[in-house]
């Protein structure tokens, strides 16, 4: 085995980025760091066979299987997959190692299987075997995290019952509002399950695995904030845990906090208090209200009171099933070519939704923003002034919701003409939908003012192109107009556009556009 080359097998996972999808270059995408696949010599096999560690790939993921060969001289190679040979083009890296790559774009079931790479070097021949399978994500789950109190300690544990085991992190922020956005410098992340520092302004726990990332915010009433116009509302499903934190800061320790549900004090064991002095020697108190598994009768107004602050309440609603509340009637919009415009959907939902915006069979990411009144809003502005049908789709564990929008762009008609031996047709996509006139150009009417009304057939909006209506008008040829120039004109409130057609030429017809 003295002559065997030193080989390395690696897997490169690619992050799909829009611009590269569908291109099949050797290095199509932004890639993550290569993962070593081992490539051990397979014992008891005829010939020299290396076997790479099995590769599991998500559906639609893009990967590169790569072999690095440290052997003198040139190499030639051949890939074989399901008895078909595939082209193989080795090249050399900066360390003069032979590099052979197989790019798999957008993994599908048909691309799973054994990939054999035959390599011939000056010294020896050998085979490398890769087994690629699709990861069975049907068994995967990602559940929203929830909180539990740590036994005998003033600390919260964050739990997410997910497969595979998720990475759990606390996301903490001590500013107000916008500065608590995920990538803000005010945000601190702690990759641990237990949190002891519970005095922060904004506390969230997030769980992530192969399916994505889910977060739960610790619902908080801050008595130092001016009471909101809209009472905060918290939805939970039967059996879920309830956690509400009441927080207050005062110049000294001479105040206490209490929780009440519908004017009755919470039972012992359904709350716990913590206090600390802040850097400026003011006292911070927090009082947690919690129920380990809610029932319908835990619905109601939870009020936090203090002797030194205005009381504030939250309405807790326990539901049997999740929901998405929004108006699903379709909406039509008409805008100018350069007008700024966004579609928007206002909804109330529990649990939080996952959503997409779709246009012309292409999906766009969907962002949602919480409003003060318990509703959320999703906006879509990236329509690039393309007319057509836009679809908002939202779903959670228990409900689905779809809303249709139509976008019309006001513009002057553009006319296209075509003709055959028996008729001439004109098409236009202007909006509002144009009306049509046909005119005959003759010695009597050199300016083409003689209107043709016989044999004209208008079809309004006869076909949809990505939701964009197209209007057409057809003129049946008669002896009276054969050999003449005719002009079709489409007009709407924004202008007129015409095409001139000669009605006696066989074969391709000459068209003259005049606007």
């Amino acid at each position: 085995n003295q002559d065997l080359p030193v080989i390395k097998c690696v897997l490169i996972n690619h992050k799909n980025n829009d611009s590269s999808v569908g291109k099949s270059s050797s290095y199509p995408m932004v890639s993550e760091s290569p993962e070593d696949l081992g490539c051990a010599l397979r014992p008891q096999s005829s010939g020299t066979v290396y076997e790479a560690a099995a590769v599991e790939v998500d559906v639609s993921a893009s990967i590169t299987l790569q072999v690095l060969v440290d052997a003198p001289g040139n190499i030639s190679c051949l890939w074989v997959f399901k008895h078909s040979s595939l082209n193989c083009q080795p090249h050399f890296d900066l360390q003069n190692r032979g590099v052979v790559s197989m790019v798999i774009l957008k993994m599908t079931e048909t691309q799973a299987g054994e990939y054999l790479l035959f390599i011939q070097s000056e010294a020896t021949n050998y085979t490398i075997l890769f087994t690629v399978s699709i990861r069975n994500t049907l068994l995967y789950t990602l559940r929203r995290p929830y909180f539990r109190k740590m036994e005998n300690q003033d600390a919260l544990v964050c739990i997410s019952e997910s497969v595979p085991e998720p990475i759990v992190e606390w996301v903490l922020c001590d500013s107000q509002g916008e500065s608590c956005k995920e990538e803000s410098p005010a945000v601190v992340k702690k990759e641990e399950k237990v949190l002891h520092e519970l005095f922060g302004t904004d506390i969230r726990c997030c769980a992530r695995n192969e399916l994505g990332r889910e977060c739960t915010r610790l619902f908080t009433i801050d008595l130092n904030q001016t009471p909101q116009t809209t009472l905060p509302q918290l939805f939970l499903k039967v059996g879920e845990p309830l956690w509400i934190r009441c927080k207050a800061v005062h110049v000294n320790h001479g105040f206490g906090l209490t929780w009440e549900l519908e004017n009755k004090a919470l039972e012992e064991g359904n709350y716990f208090e913590m206090s600390t002095y802040s850097t400026n020697r003011t006292m911070i108190r927090i009082l947690f209200a919690f129920v380990s598994s809610v029932a319908r009768n835990d619905t109601g107004y939870y009020t936090c009171s203090s002797s030194k602050h205005p009381s504030q309440s939250a309405l807790v609603t326990i539901v049997e099933k999740g929901f998405i509340n929004a108006t699903n009637s379709s909406e039509d919009y008409e805008i100018d070519q350069y007008e700024e415009f966004c579609f928007s959907v206002r909804f109330k939902a529990y649990p939080q939704i996952r959503c997409t915006w779709t246009f012309s069979r292409k999906s766009f990411p969907c962002e949602q923003k919480g409003l003060d009144n318990g509703y959320s809003i999703s906006k879509f502005c990236n329509h690039k002034h393309q007319p057509g049908e836009y679809i908002f789709h939202a779903e959670n564990d228990d409900a689905q919701f779809t809303k249709m929008f139509t976008l019309n762009i006001r513009r002057k008609p553009q006319v296209l003409a075509e003709a055959s031996a028996s008729q001439a047709s004109c098409f236009s996509d202007g909006y509002p939908l144009p009306s049509w006139t046909w005119k005959k150009c003759s010695d009597k009417s050199p300016n083409c003012t003689e209107e043709i009304t016989e044999g004209v057939w208008n079809r309004k909006a006869n076909r949809k192109v990505f939701g964009q209506w197209v209007s057409s008008s057809t003129l049946n040829m008669s002896e009276a107009i054969k050999g003449f120039l005719v002009k079709c004109c489409a007009y709407n409130s924004l202008g007129t556009s015409c095409e001139t057609i000669l009605l006696n030429s066989p074969g391709p017809f000459p068209f003259i556009q005049d606007n």
């Epitope: 009472l231 004017n263 107004y301 009020t303 009171s305 002797s307 205005p310 009381s311 309440s313 309405l315």
Partner: nanobody
Framework: QVQLQESGGGLVQPGGSLRLSCAAS????????IDWYRQAPGKQREWVAQ???????FYADSVKGRFAISRENAKNTVYLQMNSLKPEDTAVYYC?????WGQGTQVTVSS
């Protein structure tokens, strides 16, 4: 069905006084805290004052020392005594219990 009814609004000169009332039916006032809010034309509704079940009172900075909130549990009514009124106090004044709001009463401070 909870119903709140405000009254006592009107037109008053700067420096003058008004006493607003908020009467409730369908809810026991004595066991709840009550808030007064106001909304000036073209502005968002803002919190003005609160009286708790134990008759502790709290005020927004803009009205502290000029307004006084009180309650009469037997009549299921809360009052807002407004003194030294300023033009910027012009607004519709609302009372609120939990999620329930009254229709509001107009206060105009103008010479």
């Amino acid at each position: 069905q909870v119903q709140l009814q405000e009254s006592g609004g009107g037109l008053v000169q700067p420096g003058g006084s008004l006493r607003l009332s908020c009467a409730a039916s369908g809810v026991t006032f004595s066991i709840n805290y009550i808030d007064w809010y106001r909304q000036a034309p073209g502005k968002q509704r803002e919190w003005v004052a609160q009286i708790t079940r134990d008759s502790n009172s709290f005020y927004a900075d803009s009205v502290k020392g000029r307004f006084a909130i009180s309650r009469e549990n037997a009549k299921n009514t809360v009052y807002l005594q407004m003194n030294s009124l300023k033009p910027e106090d012009t607004a519709v004044y609302y009372c609120r219990v939990l999620s329930y709001w009254g229709q509001g009463t107009q206060v105009t401070v103008s010479s």
